[in-house]
């Protein structure tokens, strides 16, 4: 039975040209995290394997930095970066847990961070 929950940074906003940290945290399970995949709708951004390190997709390599931790830093944001991002935790023996983050990239200099929320 999958008992874990993923806590994410929730709905967040950031300024065009700036950067943002996408962060998820898996709790309430003793399952071992083998890797975390970061995806944006249909695209793979990066993979962090707990043992083998990071894979950064070539189409994002100039704008994505690994970390902190299992998180991902998106840089040089554009309005086109607005949308859903998913952290997919591959765990043993539980299986897969998915967290969702919605990022809005604003033209304006007013960019507020949304509250954290949990996905069971």
């Amino acid at each position: 039975m999958m008992t874990g929950t993923i806590e994410t940074t929730g709905n967040i906003s950031a300024e065009k040209g700036g950067s943002i940290i996408l962060q998820c945290h898996l709790s309430s399970t003793t399952a071992q995290v083998t890797q975390v995949n970061w995806e944006q709708q249909d695209q793979l951004l990066a993979i962090c394997n707990a043992d083998l390190g990071w894979h950064i997709s070539p189409s994002f390599k100039d704008r994505v930095a690994p970390g902190p931790g299992l998180g991902l830093t998106l840089q040089s944001l554009t309005v086109n970066d607005t949308g859903e991002y998913f952290c997919i935790y591959h765990t043993y023996p539980d299986g897969t847990y998915t967290g969702r983050i919605f990022l809005e990239v604003l033209e304006s200099s007013v960019a507020e961070h949304g509250a954290r929320f949990q996905i069971p």
Partner: antibody
């Protein structure tokens, strides 16, 4: 230039162990994970596992968990793969191969080591 | 484990022909796919990474495309030196797995 040079062919009896080495040169050894892939005669390539020389973290295919052991000697820029409890089905060519910097594709390969298991 | 199904398993073509090999993953792997060329008695060589990026020094006649579960590897104009077995490889999640290979021969 990057080179991965493996140890020579081995003939082993069923139940024995084999340890294959892979000496890396031409790059910073700790910056790329090292993987082991085998190919039995006429078969597809099969991933055994990988090791991160930076922290000795290992990831194994479940099929080889407990039977394969991956290690590194960073001072000698050498990776090792030990396979125990050998059986005839383990007869194969064993390759060491490194993954690209910040990517998981396998960009350089050793020349292969033939391991024959026969009574 | 993710199964990789490659087709055809063998194919015969003439010099100058356009050759297409397909690889199907048993689940969505986004673009976490590479293609390798292996000649008899030799180690594999990386040709294409992340589904569509040509590796350094690989001739432009080799290309890859696809995302999700369906991928294609193409040789636009077959050359005699392209005779080899070609493999796809997924690294979306461990254990990493390979296709069964496509053996390419000259007619």
């Amino acid at each position: 230039q990057v080179q991965l040079v493996q140890s020579g062919a081995e003939v082993k009896k069923p139940g024995a162990s084999v340890k294959v080495s892979c000496k890396a040169s031409g790059y910073t050894f700790t910056e790329n994970a090292m993987h082991w892939v085998r190919q039995a005669p006429g078969q597809r390539l099969e991933w055994i596992g990988g090791i991160n020389p930076n922290n000795a973290g290992t990831s194994y295919s479940q099929k080889f968990q407990g039977r394969a052991t991956l290690t590194v000697d960073t001072s000698a820029s050498t990776a090792y793969m030990e396979l125990s409890s050998l059986r005839s089905e383990d007869t194969a060519v064993y390759y060491c191969t490194r993954s690209s910097y910040y990517r998981y594709d396998l960009d350089y390969w050793g020349q292969g080591t033939t391991v024959t298991v026969s009574s | 484990d993710i199964q990789m199904t490659q087709s055809p398993s063998s194919l015969s073509a003439s010099v100058g022909d356009r050759v297409t090999i397909t690889c199907q993953a048993s689940q969505d792997i986004k673009t976490a796919l590479a293609w390798y060329q292996q000649k008899p008695g030799k180690a594999p060589k990386l040709l294409i990474y992340s589904a569509s990026y040509r590796y350094t020094g690989v001739p432009s006649r080799f290309s890859g495309s696809g995302s999700g579960t369906d991928f294609t590897f193409t040789i636009s104009s077959l050359q005699p030196e392209d005779i080899a077995t070609y493999y796809c490889h997924q690294h979306y999640t461990t254990p990493w797995t390979f296709g069964g290979g496509t053996k390419l021969e000259i007619k």
